[in-house]
Amino acid sequence: QSSLTPLMVNGILGESVTLPLEFPAGEKVNFITWLFNETSLAFIVPHETKSPEIHVTNPKQGKRLNFTQSYSLQLSNLKMEDTGSYRAQISTKTSAKLSSYTLRILRQLRNIQVTNHSQLFQNMTCELHLTCSVEDADDNVSFRWEALGNTLSSQPNLTVSWDPRISSEQDYTCIAENAVSNLSFSVSAQKLCEDVKIQYTDTKM
């Protein structure tokens, strides 16, 4: 990747990622420097007859760093702080080639939950106020609510009226997704409204 257009690479929190390095064809490489946010990560001197010399210069990521046979960078047990700009400089006798990368770390979504604040009106219509959440949600998480294949909401919240006298059993499903995972959680309108009805009856007595 040229330094002007960094290659964007997705990594998953806790997993591994490889930043691929392409060599100049037919040229002898003198050394390779890997940088993270403009700070040296590693310095590699290839040898034709023996193993390359690898000098890891960043102790913070050092234990999680590895290099493939083609000196692509492998980073394991990814952390959020690994997000950022990576560069590889390949120096040959005649030139220096620069490859740029932007690594973003995405979380596998987990622990989807739905909270319910519903009301029962005098006419026995049940108004559902549902809120969906996942652990550590960020701006890259998309939420939506669906019922019978139709999207009823594109936000974590859903407000909907349900009348047991005219509506059949209805499930509402929250779907949370990002670029690397998706989760869903379904709730029954009938069940939620029955619970509200019990509370409503209890308070009336």
Partner: antibody, heavy 118, light 106 residues
Framework: QIQLVQSGSELKKPGASVKVSCKAS????????MNWVRQAPGQDLKWMGW????????RYADDFKGRFVFSLDKSVNTAYLQISSLKAEDTAVYYC???????????WGQGTTVTVSS | QIVLSQSPATLSLSPGERATMSCRAS?????MHWYQQKPGQAPRPWIY???NLASGVPARFSGSGSGTDYTLTISSLEPEDFAVYYC?????????FGGGTKVEIK
């Protein structure tokens, strides 16, 4: 039917402010996020950010932090975009667009042209 | 941010011909949306989540792709298809649009 109707064209002087409205009808306003998209003359579409119509919480793209404010009046199902300290480069068509999920904009306003000129 | 590169910038074709346009993302995305825009009009939703046609979109349109490469195809151009088509990704904030492909009459 579902529609978004935006306020009319505006001609403003540099340094002034403008408030663009987007009135929604035909659906439950608080169930769908509202996005704002800018298209400068002869240019591509640029996503400015969105507002959660249930909580009222706005989110801005980096290029639109500072002078741009998204707001709501839920009682009249209307979203607003306010731009302060207008510059000539703010001259553009501004669109509101409903998010149907996965940031797919299934309904668009007709657009509001804002012209900034001295 | 994820950069979307659309190619070609302009497609000059005649009615009845097949049109294929590409949208390449600088990073892998889960799905791509497409919009059609005609001069002086707001964009219109065209293809949702890579391959689903929006309401009212004719079956001669199709979408495909995965990862970083996505394609919109028109099997046989009709006069009303001449317009600009934009791709848009949702996987990462900010949501970004491609630069558009203009399909013009040859």
């Amino acid at each position: 039917q579902i529609q978004l109707v935006q306020s009319g064209s505006e001609l403003k002087k540099p340094g002034a402010s403008v408030k663009v409205s987007c009135k929604a009808s035909g659906y439950t306003f608080t169930n769908y996020g509202m996005n704002w998209v800018r298209q400068a003359p002869g240019q591509d579409l640029k996503w400015m950010g969105w507002i959660n119509t249930y909580s009222g919480e706005p989110r801005y793209a980096d290029d639109f932090k500072g002078r741009f404010v998204f707001s709501l009046d839920k009682s009249v199902n209307t979203a607003y975009l306010q731009i302060s300290s207008l510059k000539a480069e703010d001259t553009a068509v501004y669109y509101c667009a409903r998010d149907y999920g996965r940031w797919y904009f299934d309904v668009w306003g007709q657009g509001t042209t804002v012209t900034v000129s001295s | 941010q994820i950069v979307l590169s659309q190619s070609p910038a302009t497609l000059s074709l005649s009615p009845g011909e097949r049109a294929t346009m590409s949208c390449r993302a600088s990073s892998s995305v889960s799905h791509m949306h497409w919009y059609q825009q005609k001069p002086g009009q707001a964009p219109r939703p065209w293809i949702y989540a890579t391959s689903n046609l929006a309401s009212g979109v004719p079956a001669r349109f199709s979408g495909s792709g995965s990862g970083t490469d996505y394609t919109l195809t028109i099997s046989s151009l009709e006069p009303e298809d001449f317009a600009v088509y934009y791709c848009q990704q949702w996987s990462s904030t900010p949501r970004t649009f491609g630069g558009g492909t203009k399909v013009e009459i040859k």
